[in-house]
């Protein structure tokens, strides 16, 4: 018979034949042959593989480094990685939670809508038209543009969400 060019789900093609993939939590020791099944071995104590695979090495569980403010939220198994979270009152810097911050800052162009608490991180909002923020801050709201008119001045440069307006003297020349 013709050697296969594709294999079923949970199989892989090697040496013109379809071998079974190793199940999650196990790594490949040796490919199948015409006479033997794929040989797999369970991952070690601090290792995992989370898919049907032909990996020869298991992945190391993530280390939740206490020096970065991390602690274990969920211990890893042979089929799942460890999930880290931050110490109480601290917040993850990303979905993967690789490090912790006390709170995040709102970038220029954004103001603080709600200051961080022990439970929730800083909530930022874009500065609307007429307001700006030129700093990175965890407490400052968007500031209103300066009103040139109230100072008997005129707008020389328009404001943006990151910059205030620039006021200047009125043109004294009259037609």
């Amino acid at each position: 018979p013709e050697p296969p060019t594709a294999c079923r789900e949970k199989q892989y093609l090697i040496n013109s034949q379809c071998c079974s993939l190793c199940q999650p939590g196990q790594k490949l020791v040796s490919d199948c042959t015409e006479f033997t099944e794929t040989e797999c071995l369970p991952c070690g104590e601090s290792e995992f593989l989370d898919t049907w695979n032909r990996e020869t090495h298991c992945h190391q569980h993530k280390y939740c480094d206490p020096n970065l403010g991390l602690r274990v939220q969920q211990k890893g198994t042979s089929e799942t990685d460890t999930i880290c979270t931050c110490e109480e009152g601290w917040h993850c810097t990303s979905e993967a939670c690789e490090s912790c911050v006390l709170h995040r800052s709102c970038s220029p162009g954004f103001g603080v809508k709600q200051i961080a608490t022990g439970v929730s991180d800083t909530i930022c909002e874009p500065c609307p038209v007429g307001f700006f923020s030129n700093v990175s801050s965890a407490f400052e709201k968007c500031h209103p543009w300066t009103s040139c008119e109230t100072k008997d001045l005129v707008v020389q440069q328009a404001g943006t969400n990151k910059t205030d307006v620039v006021c200047g003297p009125q043109d004294r020349l009259r037609a």
């Epitope: 020096n67 970065l68 403010g69 110490e87 601290w90 810097t93 490090s99 912790c100 911050v101 006390l102 709170h103 995040r104 800052s105 700093v135 990175s136 801050s137 965890a138 407490f139 400052e140």
Partner: nanobody
Framework: EVQLLESGGGLVQPGGSLRLSCAAS???????EVWWVRQAPGKGLERVS?????????YYADSVKGRFTISRDDSKNTLYLQMNSLRAEDTAVYYC?????????WGQGTLVTVSS
């Protein structure tokens, strides 16, 4: 490596005053927003006060408004918290924190105990 060292804590009677200091070494406070944060025994972190990088804007938690004053001296690379009219509920370890607020920009804290 940035190190923040808080000092000035101690035992004080209700109604008394203390001035906390936070000195930065290995880096600078200049131009950075800085916070005072406290942790009372058995409680979570509470954000007490903050000062902008320019020193022009400040924030105070409602619980300390009118009693605490935050200030900075960038020439001395030091942050201050003047605490007046102290109450028993101000008892806590006080920490300073500098932008970017990562765990390694975090001091050991100074203990303030308000008790008669």
């Amino acid at each position: 490596e940035v190190q923040l060292l808080e000092s000035g804590g101690g035992l004080v009677q209700p109604g008394g005053s203390l001035r906390l200091s936070c000195a930065a070494s290995g880096s600078t406070f200049a131009g950075y927003e800085v916070w005072w944060v406290r942790q009372a025994p058995g409680k979570g972190l509470e954000r007490v006060s903050a000062i902008s990088g320019s020193g022009g804007s400040t924030y105070y938690a409602d619980s300390v408004k009118g009693r605490f004053t935050i200030s900075r001296d960038d020439s001395k690379n030091t942050l201050y918290l003047q605490m007046n009219s102290l109450r028993a509920e101000d008892t806590a370890v006080y920490y300073c924190a500098r932008d970017p607020y990562s765990f390694d920009y975090w001091g050991q804290g100074t203990l303030v105990t308000v008790s008669s």
